[in-house]
């Protein structure tokens, strides 16, 4: 028989983690495996049909994507949809596929809303999701004794699809669910100094443990301004929510692993400011299969898609599409073996959820509502050389924090700063005022 | 030949102005006219196919509506779509129909965004739209000498589809385009007293000419609180943006034409407070055809749809669907006469735009970008008996304000209050400080 996979991803723009130039080769590699393995869909042909989730400007679109999905459904009646990745594109498509009772598989769509499976029925996320970041941060808070207050800042940048809004939304909601904690969240515009200065006025009153989702340059600017305002000492800790590790990568901007460095006149100050900074990223898979997969992926991307794939965490997304597709095909194979059909979306989906799977990204666990458990890394500066390195990993499946041996978190005080200052944010603790008065007697 | 009209409107919930129980009878009456008139589509049959824009709870939905549109397109390949009316339902449908190059005709979708015809190509709005309210308000400001500052308040009520947000958005953007004026806008929650108190603190610093979109009860509450705070004297004017005249209707709530009256202990104060209030509504058509149409509409609604239609401005919406559909059929007839086809959406649409038409709602003008010119009424209190009555009408086609003979706007000072107080909002006018100092010498 024939199994049709309808792809709705950016076909022209290569800059998204889920661009077809990146995911296409991963799909090819997965389908090559299906062909090579007699236990997967024996006697079946799997073919892909493509629709674009971009508008004419190459930007993800909440109109183009569902229109593409409708056209594909109409013409090809696919068994499964692959993508979209962008939140605004995935939302209408996911609601359509739910209505059609056709499975949707993606390694994007990380926003909180997609976890609501009455609205997004049969949507499986084989990639990371922002609520899972909340699981990590909650575990971190428990470990470090921060159970009362946090502050989350997120940048608004025109044309970035509100990435940081959705990231902080997922993080905020899940942390609040997991811990009985006060969390404030504030938005700022990266290209307006007044937004930074207002944040700096607010910080002393609102938090000492601060999460920031922004571009690497904006994070550095904020750290420099915080240093200038005297907010970068031992009392504060700033977590950069840099999930794809952009600031650690080198290239045009920061030096590799030295996210404070730009080769400009502010490097000395920036290095000092970054002593109060830590960086949160997805975890890079460290299994040998992943490295082998990346070699093949890059080769295929260049050969068949004329695309040169850079290194970095962004490649975990095509790898997750690869693993997700294999998991889906495994589920279809089992459904057929039990007398079902490829159009039995509910049955197939149920076989994917609450299941573990060994993929190129390592051990992969899809939870009971169809979302992948996600691993994260926490990076900290080595005070000796200013380079950042992973000091702690979070295993999403076991929900455990695992220290990297021989490395520990670096705290200027020798211990984590309290999440609420000793005397309260506005010196409101009566005991402190009492002390203060007694010294005047 | 056959011409298929695909309807995407609320089929179950009768509370929307564009519910099928209201619009259906209007469509029936229009199609009866087509049958009866030999000059309209001779030899053609017009049929309607129905899709619902509501979700399972009977609420307009940005998922249900485009899904319905897709299903109708698929199964019936219609020549035109009628509806949706709700903003969130109409947005994806309008983008889909633009992509399909199929005309969309509605008397809803009043939000500013639908005026952008590169995105909503072939969308014709035969009903009122919020940007046109801005044309009226700009004309009013010119007439009354308010060319510097205004304040717009809009209520957020869960589940009301952000009606007031969209209304104030259209008003705000168009007034700013038409006049070189500073306009501030603030949102408030109708069910939170702290929001009202914050508004009352803000008003003295932000405006004297104040537009308020809210429920009648919330407007009355705000007026009572303003009176209590001393903000209701001759210095302020409060315009209730009550476009369907809900507060003037009687029934369960206010007495007819006495929007301040509730038969409670606050009526005396409310009447006093409402001396600073004016009400803006759509204009009730006063042509004899409209009254005759309403009689038939109500009869048909009861007979065929088992729905009892109340009186009120809300009936201008089904009437506008009626007129719009006849205008569309006129345009199709002309297109066919010129050798075109019913699928020639561009040509048909061009024949509807920039065109006048005598309908049951009176003289109807569609502007050059496919939006109907809209008439408004301004209501003011008769100080003698406390009843509100129309004192001024706005003709959207001629863009003129037309006073109702024998009636004039009622101003406590005898003239409109200035939009900026004599000494500025914060007494910042140096001349005033000078005066003030001189009295101390």
């Amino acid at each position: 028989g024939n199994l049709t996979v309808a792809v709705v991803l950016p076909l022209a723009n290569t800059s998204y983690p889920w661009s077809w130039a990146r995911v296409g080769p991963a799909v090819e590699l997965a389908l090559a495996q299906v062909k090579a393995r007699p236990d997967l869909l024996p006697g079946w042909t799997v073919r892909t049909v493509l629709g674009s989730s971009e508008n004419a400007l190459g930007v993800c679109s909440d109109t183009a994507a569902p229109l593409a999905a409708v056209d594909l459904k109409w013409e090809h009646n696919p068994a499964v949809f692959l993508g979209p990745g962008c939140v605004y594109a995935a939302a209408p498509v996911g609601r359509f596929t739910a209505h059609w009772r056709v499975p949707l598989l993606t390694a994007g769509a990380p926003a909180l809303g997609f976890g609501v499976k009455d609205e997004y029925a049969l949507t499986t996320r084989a990639g990371p999701s922002y609520a899972k970041l909340g699981d990590f941060v909650a575990a971190l808070h428990r470990r470090l004794g921060w159970e009362r207050q946090a502050l989350m800042l997120y940048a608004y940048r025109p044309g970035d699809e509100e990435h940081c809004f959705f990231l902080v939304e997922g993080l905020f909601m899940r942390v609040r669910d997991r811990l009985n904690i006060t969390v404030d969240h504030l938005e700022f515009a990266e290209d307006d100094l007044s937004h930074y200065t207002r944040l700096l006025r607010t910080m002393p009153r609102k938090g000492r443990v601060i999460y920031i989702c922004s571009s690497p340059d904006a994070f550095r600017t904020l750290m420099l301004l915080a240093l200038e305002a005297g907010l970068c000492g031992e009392d504060y800790v700033f977590f950069h929510l840099d999930i794809f590790g952009q600031s650690l990568q080198g290239g045009q901007g920061p030096a590799p692993r030295r996210p404070w460095e730009r080769g400009d006149g502010q490097d000395v100050s920036a290095r000092q400011a970054f002593q109060a900074a830590k960086i949160i990223t997805y975890k890079d898979p460290d299994n040998p299969e992943y490295l082998e997969f990346l070699k093949q992926l890059k080769h295929l991307a260049y050969e068949q898609f004329n695309f040169t794939m850079e290194d970095g965490l962004v490649n975990t997304i095509p790898a997750s599409f690869h693993d997700g597709l294999l998991l889906y095909i495994q589920a279809v194979t089992e459904t057929l073996a039990h007398g079902g059909t490829v159009t039995d979306g509910e049955n197939i989906t149920q076989r994917m959820w609450n299941r573990s799977f060994q993929g190129v990204t390592g051990y992969l666990k899809i939870d009971s509502s169809g979302d992948r458990e996600t691993d994260f890394s926490l990076w900290d500066m080595d005070p000796e050389n200013g380079a950042f390195r992973v000091v702690l990993n979070y295993n999403g499946t076991s929900q455990e924090l695992v220290a990297v041996s021989g490395r520990k978190l670096n705290w200027p005080l020798g211990y984590p700063p309290p999440d609420i200052p000793k005397c309260g944010f506005d010196n409101e603790d009566p005991a402190c005022n009492q002390d203060h008065l007694s010294t005047l007697e | 030949g056959n011409l298929t009209v695909a309807v995407v409107l609320p089929l179950a919930n009768t509370s929307y102005p564009w519910s099928w129980a209201r619009v259906g009878p209007a469509v029936e009456l229009a199609l009866a006219q087509v049958k009866a008139r030999p000059d309209l589509l001779p030899g053609w049959t017009v049929r309607t196919v129905l899709g619902s824009s509501e979700n399972a709870l009977g609420v307009c939905s940005d998922t249900a509506a485009p899904l319905a549109a897709v299903d109708l397109k698929w199964e019936h390949n219609p020549a035109v779509f009628l509806g949706p009316g709700c903003v969130y339902a109409a947005a994806p449908v309008g983008r889909f129909t633009a992509h399909w190059r199929v005309p969309l005709l509605t008397a809803g979708a009043p939000a500013l965004g639908f005026g952008v015809k590169d995105e909503y190509a072939l969308t014709t709005r035969a009903g009122p739209s919020y940007a046109k309210l801005g044309d009226f308000v700009a004309a009013l400001h010119r007439r009354l000498g308010w060319e510097r500052q205004a304040l717009m308040l809009y209520a957020y009520r869960p589940g009301d589809e952000e009606h007031c947000f969209f209304l104030v958005e259209g008003l705000f953007m168009r007034v700013r385009d038409r006049l070189n004026i500073t306009v501030d806008h603030l949102e408030f929650a109708e069910d939170d007293l702290s929001h009202y108190t914050r508004l009352l603190r803000t008003m003295p610093r932000k405006g004297r000419v104040i537009y308020i979109c809210s429920s009648p009860d919330a407007f009355r509450t705000l007026m009572l609180l303003a009176l209590e705070a001393g903000l209701c004297g001759e210095d302020y004017v409060f315009f209730h943006l009550d476009i369907f005249g809900q507060s003037l209707q009687g029934g369960q709530g206010p007495a007819p034409r006495r929007p301040w009256e509730r038969g409670d202990g606050q009526d005396v104060s409310a009447r006093q407070a409402f001396q600073a209030a004016k009400i803006i509504t759509y204009k009730d058509p006063d042509n004899p055809e409209y009254l005759e149409f309403l009689k038939q509409l109500k009869h048909l609604a009861y007979e065929q749809f088992n729905f009892t239609m109340e009186d009120g401005l809300v009936n201008t919406i089904p009437a506008s669907f009626h007129d719009g559909l006849l205008l569309y059929i006129q345009a199709v007839t002309e297109t066919l006469a010129h050798g075109g086809t019913v699928t020639d959406g561009e040509n048909i649409t061009q024949r509807m735009w920039n065109r006048s038409f005598q309908g049951v709602t009176g003289y109807l003008k569609i502007d050059s970008s496919g939006d109907r010119e809209t008439d408004f009424s301004l209501w003011d209190m008769d100080p003698e008996n406390g009843a509100f009555r129309v004192v001024l009408n706005y003709n959207g086609t001629s863009q003129e304000l037309v006073a109702v003979s024998g009636r004039k706007l009622n101003w406590p000072l005898g003239y409109p209050p200035p939009d900026i107080p004599k000494c500025g909002f914060d007494n910042e006018d140096p001349a005033c400080n000078q005066d003030h100092l001189s009295t101390l010498e």
Partner: antibody
């Protein structure tokens, strides 16, 4: 709308003093840094002084260090430049500029006030 | 202090031409570079910040590029209103410094 209006310029003798003022509207000066930039007629632009958003950092160009003082009055939304020991070579048009250090740089400029130092 | 060197100091071009002005910093300034346009008797107007970002309201015929020490301003199709003096400026480190200017004249 952002506006910066300088005043206080004029003719002064060498060794004399002037106090330039800059009234800002459309934004709060305490949310931004502010700078003074001067331009000798027919010549290029020279930055001479800056103050950061919270007033905690003040910077001067070497060419005028010790002779100028920058200050700000947040309540009046105004910036000032006190200039002492003026020299003929200080004759220039002095612009008040909103300063977004590390973000957008010098984004809004006043039209300038002319200072003429002449005996 | 960081020196900014602009070239050329003057440039003649015709309406419709594409022109490029370069600016070099004496030490690395990453992308903290702005470009200004000044017309006689007027205050400078900010065109570009962060080396390549357009200030709001500036037409897209202006573009900037570069990072570190070498930067360029390009005007894709000259119009009569574009003939003016252009300055680059670094805002990485105080004291801020400007290039000496490039006067763009009609040929």
């Amino acid at each position: 709308e952002v506006q910066l209006v300088e005043s206080g310029g004029g003719v002064v003798r060498p060794g004399g003093s002037l106090r330039l003022s800059c009234a800002a509207s459309g934004f709060n000066v305490d949310d931004y840094g502010m700078s003074w930039v001067r331009q000798i007629p027919g010549k290029g632009l020279e930055w001479i002084s800056g103050i950061n958003w919270n007033g905690g950092r003040i910077y001067y160009a070497d060419s005028m260090k010790g002779r100028i003082t920058i200050s700000r009055d947040n309540a009046k939304n105004s910036l000032y430049l006190q200039m002492n020991s003026l020299r003929a070579e200080d004759t220039a048009l002095y612009h008040c500029v909103r300063d977004q250090w590390l973000v957008r740089g010098l984004d809004y400029w006043g039209q300038g006030t002319l200072v003429t130092v002449s005996s | 202090d960081i020196q900014m060197t602009q070239s050329p100091s003057s440039l003649s071009a015709s309406v419709g031409d594409r022109v490029t002005i370069t600016c070099r910093a004496s030490q690395g300034i990453y992308n903290y570079l702005a470009w200004f346009q000044q017309k006689p008797g007027k205050a400078p107007k900010s065109l570009i910040y962060a080396a390549s970002s357009l200030q709001s309201g500036v037409p897209s015929k202006f573009s900037g590029s570069g990072s570190g020490t070498d930067f360029t301003l390009t005007i894709s199709s000259l119009q009569p209103e574009d003939f003016a003096t252009y300055y680059c400026q670094q805002y990485n480190t105080y004291p801020y410094t400007f290039g000496q200017g490039t006067k763009l004249e009609i040929k």
